[in-house]
């Protein structure tokens, strides 16, 4: 009778084991072991027992002890079970961002590992078991479906293998995959709201505001604002589930025409976009042209108003004839025209909006000097010792210089309060002088003496 010890062994892959082959007869003709494994016999006294070291055991094997005794040949097998933990335990790659409400399929692949009968695959969310299945096939695959919820945001999913050799007197060997961190998000179906000027003038600044509600997690939302090819740099403020992105936009002559203003919100692997057109226009103020800004009285003056070719102008409230970008008027300059404003108003239609621009010029008329009865009376009669203010106003542009002298030397204090004395009496020559010339006027002062009774 042949016997083997141990009859069952569990050992790590590549490991070694000592196997003893024994026979019940004292003088066996033959005693040995049959195995493809590398073996080394350990020398022992007696000839009914042999010990072999079997090495580099890579897979399950059944070495067979045999003996040949006088009463016949017999065999006995030992069962070598190789154990090893899986080589790779991996979750199939997934996009890190998943929309809330979507079904997410987690797939774990397990390569290798033995004995398979003792190998279990577990899918986990954090420490919570989602699915547990025996490892079957190469690779073993275990899948489960998870309905993505908001509170799954930041959750770690992983896959664990358990090689349970505790029944064989060994331990529980665990291998865990690299975790997959789920990022959940909600991006509403409604596009972002975009508030901006519909028209924008060259070399000016406008403000653009893009906003959206119902986002999760709002802090992860990316906002892209652009006008044509120009990326805007918004200041973003966040609410609980909303944001508002505000940006200044400056436009130049190169941008003139219709431009696309876009606001794109990117969250996870989805985006929402709003497009709007902004018309960039150039509309300089109209030009008011006077033949000369300063003319002498009686000169013919032409006032012209010129504006953007597509504008319509009015000059001093009078529309151009025919209606268009040019208007003009002719006048003979009078003193009353001095300081007169000529106002040109231009109106341009841009993308359905009426844009108004004004320009005003003032005409200066040079005239005078003038001294007339109304402003410089020729005769004053004042009681002696009374308080009086001699008044004489010279007119003209530029304002004339006025002097009133008696006998070429004694001045009349124009505009000053004086006590009337006999000395004040007499005839004064008032002379008004400016760059436009000079005029004179005689002014007589009479002093009434008081009667003594």
């Amino acid at each position: 009778q042949t016997s083997v010890s141990p009859s069952k062994v569990i050992l790590p892959r590549g490991g070694s084991v000592l196997v003893t082959c024994s026979t019940s007869c004292d003088q066996p003709k033959l005693l040995g072991i049959e195995t493809p494994l590398p073996k080394k016999e350990l020398l022992l006294p007696g000839n009914n027992r042999k010990v072999y070291e079997l090495s580099n055991v890579q897979e399950d094997s059944q070495p067979m002890c045999y003996s040949n005794c006088p009463d016949g040949q017999s065999t006995a097998k030992t069962f070598l079970t190789v154990y090893w933990t899986p080589e790779r335990v991996e979750l199939a790659p997934l996009p890190s961002w998943q929309p809330v409400g979507k079904n997410l399929t987690l797939r774990c692949q397990v390569e290798g590992g033995a004995p398979r009968a003792n190998l279990t695959v577990v899918l986990l969310r954090g420490e919570k078991e989602l699915k547990r299945e025996p490892a079957v096939g190469e690779p073993a695959e275990v899948t489960t479906t998870v309905l993505v919820r908001r509170d799954h945001h930041g959750a770690n999913f992983s896959c664990r293998t358990e090689l349970d050799l505790r029944p064989q007197g060994l331990e529980l060997f665990e291998n865990t995959s690299a975790p997959y961190q789920l990022q959940t998000f909600v991006l509403p179906a409604t596009p972002p709201q975009l508030v901006s000027p519909r028209v924008l003038e060259v070399d000016t600044q406008g403000t653009v505001v893009c906003s959206l509600d119902g986002l999760f997690p709002v802090s992860e939302a990316q906002v892209h604002l652009a006008l044509g090819d120009q990326r805007l740099n918004p200041t973003v403020t966040y609410g609980n589930d909303s944001f508002s992105a505000k940006a200044s936009v400056s436009v130049t002559a190169e941008d003139e025409g219709t431009q696309r203003l876009t606001c794109a919100v990117i969250l996870g692997n989805q985006s929402q976009e709003t497009l709007q057109t902004v018309t960039i226009y150039s509309f300089p103020a109209p030009n008011v042209i006077l033949t000369k800004p300063e003319v002498s009285e009686g000169t013919e003056v032409t006032v012209k108003c010129e504006a953007h070719p597509r504008a319509k102008v009015t000059l001093n409230g009078v529309p151009a004839q025919p209606l268009g970008p040019r208007a003009q008027l002719l006048l003979k300059a009078t003193p009353e025209d001095n300081g007169r404003s000529f106002s040109c108003s231009a109106t341009l239609e841009v993308a359905g909006q009426l844009i108004h621009k004004n320009q005003t010029r003032e005409l200066r008329v040079l005239y005078g000097p003038r001294l007339d009865e109304r402003d410089c009376p020729g005769n004053w009669t004042w009681p002696e010792n009374s308080q009086q203010t001699p008044m004489c106003q010279a007119w003209g542009n530029p304002l004339p210089e006025l002097k009133c002298l008696k006998d070429g030397t004694f001045p009349l204090p124009i505009g000053e309060s004086v006590t009337v004395t006999r000395d004040l009496e007499g005839t004064y020559l008032c002379r008004a002088r400016s760059t436009q010339g000079e005029v004179t006027r005689k002014v007589t002062v009479n002093v009434l003496s008081p009667r003594y009774e």
Epitope: R88, G112, V136, G137, E138
Partner: antibody, heavy 120, light 112 residues
Framework: QVQLVQSGAEVKKPGASVKISCKGS????????LHWVRQAPGQRLEWIGV????????DYNQKFRGRATITRDTSASTAYMELSSLRSEDTAVYYC?????????????WGQGTALTVSS | DVVLTQSPLSLPVTLGQPASISCRSS???????????LHWYQQRPGQSPRLLIY???NRFSGVPDRFSGSGSGTDFTLKISRVEAEDVGVYFC?????????FGGGTKLEIK
């Protein structure tokens, strides 16, 4: 003992297709994946692709994607590799090899090889 | 793709003498789980390749203990402590860390 036996040599014209078989014995066929590797004259060994004999899932070297198709018949313990749109550069010895799906423990048993000649 | 460069291309050795083959990778072969999936194969003349060493240093079943593997990261070595006549053939290194899996160009071992 573990054996992988491949179909015989093939001679094909450019543009044609070839289908090579690989029959596994001496082990549980669905416990291991089967890889296909080729060796062209004067070239290094080149990995073509792998099949999970259990699930039928496959992975291919990008170079052969669209031209190579690996299938299996578990009832016959046989895997197949079909290569289409053949060209002269496909002249090589094609091997099947047993392994884990990702080859982490190496290709432990190989078929005897199938010689493919592509010539007009 | 990962390129495995073997040296020397040809290795004449006297029977009973040691032999050493180098395999250098264009990038690290350490997988994210910490394992290194670098293997060595022997191809005797007219035969299919045969697995000698898996995962850098583990001898496959039935492989004589005169064969050993070592190395880490990008540099690996196969050593034969005492060359025997049956060792004649081409030796390949191979990696299964990165996709697609690749092989070295081979080193031809011959007896002097």
């Amino acid at each position: 003992q573990v054996q992988l036996v491949q179909s015989g040599a093939e001679v094909k014209k450019p543009g044609a297709s070839v289908k090579i078989s690989c029959k596994g014995s001496g082990y549980t066929f669905t416990d291991y994946a089967l890889h296909w590797v080729r060796q062209a004259p004067g070239q290094r060994l080149e990995w073509i692709g792998v099949i999970s004999t259990y699930s039928g899932n496959t992975d291919y070297n990008q170079k052969f994607r669209g031209r190579a198709t690996i299938t299996r018949d578990t009832s016959a313990s046989t895997a197949y590799m079909e290569l289409s749109s053949l060209r002269s550069e496909d002249t090589a010895v094609y091997y099947c090899a047993r392994s884990l799906y990702f080859g982490s423990s190496g290709f432990d048993y190989w078929g005897q090889g199938t010689a493919l000649t592509v010539s007009s | 793709d990962v390129v495995l460069t073997q040296s020397p291309l040809s290795l004449p050795v006297t029977l009973g003498q040691p032999a050493s083959i180098s395999c250098r990778s264009s990038q690290t072969l350490v997988y994210r789980n910490g394992n290194t999936y670098l293997h060595w194969y022997q191809q005797r003349p007219g035969q299919s390749p045969r697995l000698l060493i898996y995962k850098v240093s583990n001898r496959f079943s039935g492989v004589p203990d005169r064969f050993s593997g070592s190395g880490s990261g990008t540099d690996f070595t196969l050593k034969i402590s005492r060359v025997e006549a049956e060792d004649v053939g081409v030796y390949f290194c191979s990696q299964n860390t990165h996709f697609p899996y690749t092989f070295g160009g081979g080193t031809k071992l011959e007896i002097k």
